[in-house]
């Protein structure tokens, strides 16, 4: 057992153009907060994947203001280590997680808004009981600098804190075998434990994990009298040699324990100690629960009480992720029906509607004829939601209630005459031309000119006129 | 403004079921989640559930067999139905609006008392 | 679930005095996911505080609240008349959403 502590040295800018003035968005004032998140093994991780070592949350900073005139190179942080306990030993290797995370305090409603600003995963290896690391790292525009450790808490020493110290028996010195336990003098290292089941009468260990058979005894926990062993008639401990030694393939070989489990032989089967967040015969199952704080942003962890059930976040509008981690573009979405432009206020999504439409999402046809009627004999037609009026010949205007002047367009061409008629005008033509509305000239001959062949007809082809 | 309106029976009969109606005005029904709370005569808060326009719900599991929450975006409207109602069920029941920040309750209803008598 | 303990069930205090309220969960609340409300007779109740410490908008500054993971304190600095009424505490960190029992705040 022991401690994995990280210290935020400082979090802001990185050098270099395009570094942002300030983590807070113009909604107004926030503060950061830190969350560091730690998985076994050097392997890729997907994101969502449960913090199988364990995680921690950061107090809240001071509230951070913009100063247009300064910006802070180092921005105000949450005071203290970062501790995460772990209850089994030190895996040695493993992934780091940092997040920065920025809380808007701005006038929202409900309350304040989390984002994720920044995060950084780093591979290490790490012994326990060294000295602190120091590291700066780089994410987008942001740059963090922080040191680590990992320490062992007592009884445990070490460098994965598996050896346990224990006062000495003997007041000068240890036993044979066993130093003293740094930094404690005055205590002794213990006998490493052995193979879990091992038989206390037949069998010992100077390994942790191993079980090695004293004369005349054999099987994977030395428990079987040996018989026929070719150990009989040797003297102490079984040597590797004559096969004495935990004989082969017992139920552990292969490590049938999944994500990071230590395996301990049992009497015909074998027993998988899962690291915290993991359960089930060979630990393949994850027992992270609503009790360690899943869901972020404001999300609810719904079910996972009982490691039997998993548990599910459901998360504020604005976020998304098996723990709400991330933030949705809702806009992207595309919510607003019928060309309407989208707008993420932060607090809630509004839809700005074009004319004739209406609703949360733009989603209502308003039907702009619905009691609108045109005068003098005029029809309704309703496109993309504007009323207009298809008026009678003789009158215009929005709902056909003027009277039209037909000849006010100058319909009638090379210097015809107008005249408004009752069912229209009428068009009095200039010498020389002829059509309702004066458009032919009349040849000499006394055949009109009529218009070139429509392309695709050849000459002599029937043609017919619209 | 955001405001939230309760509306329904006042009283209901044993084994009967209750159904109440709150609408929304002043927010989009689409942008929260919207939750049920009760509060029996001289007692304190009890929360019943919860919806989102998308359909998700989540209740109290001590009512979740008697529970429905169903929501109109059309109408900016969601319902509770309360099955197989007993005298201890009778409360004032409120509306209201689930927070942005996270599952606690910014706005509410002024509430509606329903009786639960034969 | 996460059950709420208020105490003290009823406070006797004058205005002018301070009034400390005490909130109680069975397990640690995340995140400090914990809110505080004012209802008084006859009428809804009113968001005072969130994410333990945070004041809702528009609630006057006498009122805060601190703690975290299973203790949690409303404080009103300086009792007003308006202050007396009865008072609820609600975990929103997991389901299912839970409120404490209520602590009357009474003329004394």
């Known amino acids: 057992a022991g401690v994995f502590e990280l210290q935020i040295h400082s979090f802001g800018p990185g050098p270099g153009p395009g570094a942002p003035r300030s983590p807070c968005s113009a909604r107004g004032p926030c503060r950061l907060f830190f969350r560091v998140c730690l998985k076994p093994g050097l392997s890729e991780e997907a994101a969502e994947s449960p913090c199988a070592l364990g995680a921690a949350l950061s107090a809240r900073g001071p509230v951070y203001t913009e100063q247009p005139e300064a910006p802070a190179p180092d921005l105000p942080l949450p005071n203290g280590l970062l501790q995460v306990p772990f209850r089994d030993a030190w895996p040695g290797t493993f992934s780091l997680i940092i997040e920065t995370w920025r809380e808007e305090l701005g006038d929202q409603i409900g309350g304040p808004a989390w984002s994720l600003l920044a995060r950084v995963t780093r591979r290490r290896r790490l012994a326990a009981g060294g000295p602190w690391a120091r590291d700066i790292q780089r994410a987008g525009a942001w740059e963090l600098r922080f040191s680590y450790r990992a320490r062992c808490e007592l009884p445990a020493v070490g460098t994965a804190c598996t050896r346990l110290c224990r006062p000495r028996s003997a007041p000068s010195r240890c036993g044979p075998g066993l130093r003293p336990c740094a930094p404690l003098e005055d205590e002794c290292e213990a006998p490493p434990v052995c193979r879990a089941g091992c038989s206390l009468e037949h069998g010992f260990c100077e390994q942790p994990g191993e079980c090695r058979c004293l004369e005349g005894w054999t099987g994977p926990l030395c428990m079987v009298p040996a018989s026929t062993s070719s150990c009989l008639g040797l003297r102490g401990p079984s040597s590797a040699t004559t096969g004495c030694l935990v004989p082969g393939p017992g139920p552990c070989d292969g490590n049938p324990c999944a994500n990071g489990g230590s395996c301990s032989e049992t009497p015909g089967s074998f027993e998988c100690t899962c690291p915290r967040g993991f359960y089930g015969l060979r630990c393949e199952v994850s027992g992270v629960t609503c009790a360690d704080g899943p869901c972020f942003n404001g999300g609810l962890c719904v079910g996972g009480a009982d490691p039997d059930s998993a548990y599910i976040c459901h998360c504020p509008p604005g976020f998304q992720g098996s723990n709400c981690e991330k933030r949705v573009d809702r806009c992207s979405l595309q919510p607003c029906r019928n060309g309407g432009l989208c707008l993420d206020l932060g607090h809630a999504l509004r839809c700005r509607c074009r004319a004739g439409f209406a609703g949360p999402r733009c989603e209502h046809n308003l039907d702009d004829c619905a009691g609108r009627a045109c005068a003098n004999g005029g029809t309704c037609v309703e496109g993309g939601g504007a009323h207009r009026c298809s008026c009678a010949l003789g009158f215009g205007g929005r709902d056909c209630r003027e009277r039209a002047d037909p000849c006010a367009a100058r319909p009638c061409a090379h210097g015809g005459r107008c005249y408004a008629h009752f069912s229209g005008l009428v068009c009095a033509c200039a010498p020389g031309y002829m059509g309702s509305r004066c458009e032919f000239p009349v040849h000499p001959d006394g055949v009109s000119a009529l218009p070139a062949a429509p392309p695709g007809l050849r000459p002599g082809d029937p043609q017919r006129y619209l | 403004q955001v405001q939230l309106q309760e509306s329904g029976p006042g009283l209901v009969k044993p084994s009967q079921t209750l159904s109440l109606t709150c609408t929304v005005s002043g927010a989009s029904i689409s942008s929260f989640y919207w939750s049920w709370i009760r509060q029996p005569p001289g007692k304190g808060l009890e929360w019943i559930g919860y919806i989102y326009y998308s359909g998700t719900t989540n209740y109290n599991p001590s009512l979740k067999s008697r529970v429905t929450i169903s929501v109109d975006t059309s109408k900016n409207q969601f319902s509770l139905k309360l099955s197989s109602v007993t005298a201890a069920d009778t409360a004032v029941y409120y509306c209201?609006?689930?927070?942005?920040?996270?599952?606690?309750?910014?706005?509410w209803g002024q509430g509606t008392l329903v009786t639960v008598s034969s | 679930e996460i059950v709420l303990t208020q105490s003290p069930g009823t406070l006797s205090l004058s205005p002018g005095e301070r009034a400390t309220l005490s909130c109680r969960a069975s397990q640690s609340v995340n995140k400090n996911y914990l809110a505080w409300y004012q209802q008084k007779p006859g009428q809804a109740p009113r968001l005072l505080i969130y994410?333990?410490?945070s004041r809702a908008t528009g609630i006057p500054d006498r009122f805060s609240g601190s703690g975290s993971g299973t203790d949690f304190t409303l404080t009103i600095s300086r009792l007003e008349p308006e202050d007396f009424a009865v008072y609820y505490c609600?975990?929103?960190?997991?389901?299912?959403?839970?409120f404490g029992g209520g602590t009357k705040v009474e003329i004394k």
């Open positions: 609600q975990q929103y960190d997991r389901s299912p959403l839970t």
């Open positions: 209201a609006r689930i927070a942005v920040a996270g599952f606690f309750f910014d706005y």
């Open positions: 994410g333990a410490s």
